[in-house]
């Protein structure tokens, strides 16, 4: 016998679902155990069967899922999957926000990422704060040099994707650079996209040799690439 456990916890990492009104929302809590557990759903702590919801809900027990079509503002709340068997129980909370505002390009907080000066061997964090109606797709890019040039024949910069992430609205996205070397110096860009468009801002990382005791945190002026 075994208490319930999540079989695909990586599919449950997106806790906050911020979706536009009219979209379909699907929550999944894939689980297993012995005996095979059952699943039930709560909304804001109360048993949820969708009887008061226009359009109802779809419960697919074999997929451990709850589906709501054409969500409206009254669907906002905390949805809990409760998975139980004779041995034990587990639960997980999803937060649903239904958005009614005009969806817009991601908005990046001014001054982030910030120009930074670091010493060889130190650790650096570059921050990007993104505001977006729909879940934004984030990329961290480093501007690189190819054959001695920073730009291609088309006039656009050469960039290398360092990190890709889907984050929840209003979260801070961080690029960690460990044990930096002189090669890490250069221009870094936080690029955020959603269904409306892209927004990006850049910052410079200056890396000083570790033997230089006189360095200060004065950063060069920001330069934004177009």
């Amino acid at each position: 016998q075994q208490a319930p456990y999540w079989t695909h916890p990586q599919r449950m990492e997106k806790k906050l679902h911020a979706v536009p009104a009219g979209n379909t929302v699907k929550f999944r809590c894939p689980a297993a155990g012995n005996p095979t557990p059952t699943i039930r759903w709560l909304k804001d702590g109360q048993a949820f069967h969708g009887e008061n919801r226009i359009g109802g809900i779809r419960l697919r027990h074999q997929h451990w899922s709850l589906v709501m079509e054409s969500v409206v503002p009254s669907d906002r709340g905390t949805y809990t999957c409760l998975v139980e068997n004779a041995v034990g129980s587990i639960r997980y909370n999803y937060l649903l926000d239904v958005l009614e505002r005009s969806p817009h390009r991601p908005i990046l907080q001014a001054g982030l990422p910030a120009n930074t000066t670091a010493v060889v061997g130190s650790d650096v964090e570059l921050l990007c704060k993104v505001y977006s109606d729909a879940q934004p797709h984030i990329q961290w890019l480093k501007h690189i040099v190819i054959n001695g040039s920073s730009f291609g024949a088309d006039g656009f910069p050469y960039v290398q994707v360092l990190k890709t992430a889907d984050i929840n609205s209003s979260e801070v996205e961080v690029l960690y650079l460990r044990n930096v070397s002189a090669e890490d110096a250069g221009e870094y860009t936080c690029l955020a996209g959603n269904s409306i468009g892209l927004s990006y801002q850049s910052a410079w990382l200056t890396v000083l040799p570790e033997e230089d005791p006189t360095w200060t945190a004065a950063a060069p002026e920001a330069r934004y690439t177009d």
């Epitope: 979706v19 536009p20 009219g22 979209n23 005009s102 969806p103 817009h104 390009r105 908005i107 990046l108 907080q109 001014a110 729909a134 879940q135 797709h137 990329q139 890019l141 088309d154 656009f156 910069p157 960039v159 994707v161 860009t189 690029l191 996209g193 959603n194 269904s195 409306i196 468009g197 892209l198 927004s199 990006y200 801002q201 934004y224 177009d226």
Partner: antibody
Framework: EVQLLESGGGVVQPGRSLRLSCAAS????????MHWVRQAPGKGLEWVAV????????YYADSVKGRFTISRDNSKNTLSLQMNSLRVEDTAIYYC?????????????????WGQGTMVTVSS | DIVMTQTPLSLSVTPGQPASISCTSS???????????VYWYVQKSGQPPQLLIY???NRFSGVPDRFSGSGSRTDFTLKISRVEAEDVGVYYC?????????FGGGTKVEIK
């Protein structure tokens, strides 16, 4: 060559349904948001709907909300617009337009590629 | 919704002469990333719109350098330095900041 090709237009009576399709080629369809824009005869351009690259987000113009549904099949490089409860004022050429992509925008981040359009006539 | 107002409604230009089209938005199109998201299109008879200018002043690939875009925040201008016969069509501005994306009413450019 980057191309968008709409199909499915035709003449339909008010209250009936029609489904438009847009076949994409020459680019990684699954990495781009996609839009529908329409143009009534002799009139200007009106944005209709957008769907995100993975289909998780959809937005609609107020004039079609609740009647039209945008969807996509990334495995077939196809964008669709299901139009229900059609009205005479929905008569227009419907254009499929490429939106923002994932990654660095080498040029405009969308609204650069338009299909030739498909004509929808709603008439009794 | 952001309203895009275009003037004039129509324009008759002598070949080789300049032309200017104005577009005003009801809200600023200057975004937090420092870019101004106004686009300009031309639509020739029986064709879909073709992109001319993006992000206020960037010419799209293949667009002749006689076309230029300028402006700031809410007031935008498309200029054709020397109009050619092939420039006839209807010109539209568009805001690409938020949904619903909105277009100006169009300016019809004709050759005298």
């Amino acid at each position: 060559e980057v191309q968008l090709l709409e199909s499915g237009g035709g003449v339909v009576q008010p209250g009936r349904s029609l489904r438009l399709s847009c076949a994409a080629s020459g680019f990684t369809f699954s990495s781009y948001a996609m839009h529908w824009v329409r143009q009534a005869p002799g009139k200007g351009l009106e944005w209709v709907a957008v769907i995100s690259y993975d289909g998780s987000n959809k937005y609609y113009a107020d004039s079609v909300k609740g009647r039209f549904t945008i969807s996509r099949d990334n495995s077939k490089n196809t964008l669709s617009l299901q139009m229900n409860s059609l009205r005479v004022e929905d008569t227009a050429i419907y254009y499929c337009v490429r939106g923002a992509g994932l990654g660095w925008p080498y040029g405009p981040d969308g609204f650069d590629i338009w299909g030739q359009g498909t004509m929808v006539t709603v008439s009794s | 919704d952001i309203v895009m107002t275009q003037t004039p409604l129509s324009l008759s230009v002598t070949p080789g002469q300049p032309a200017s089209i104005s577009c005003t938005s009801s809200r600023s199109l200057l975004h937090s990333d420092g870019k101004t998201y106004v686009y300009w299109y031309v639509q020739k008879s029986g064709q879909p719109p073709q992109l001319l200018i993006y992000e206020l002043s960037n010419r799209f690939s293949g667009v002749p350098d006689r076309f230029s875009g300028s402006g700031s925040r809410t007031d935008f201008t498309l200029k054709i330095s020397r109009v050619e016969a092939e420039d006839v069509g209807v010109y539209y501005c568009m805001q690409y900041v938020e949904a619903p994306l909105t277009f100006g009413g169009g300016t019809k450019v004709e050759i005298k």
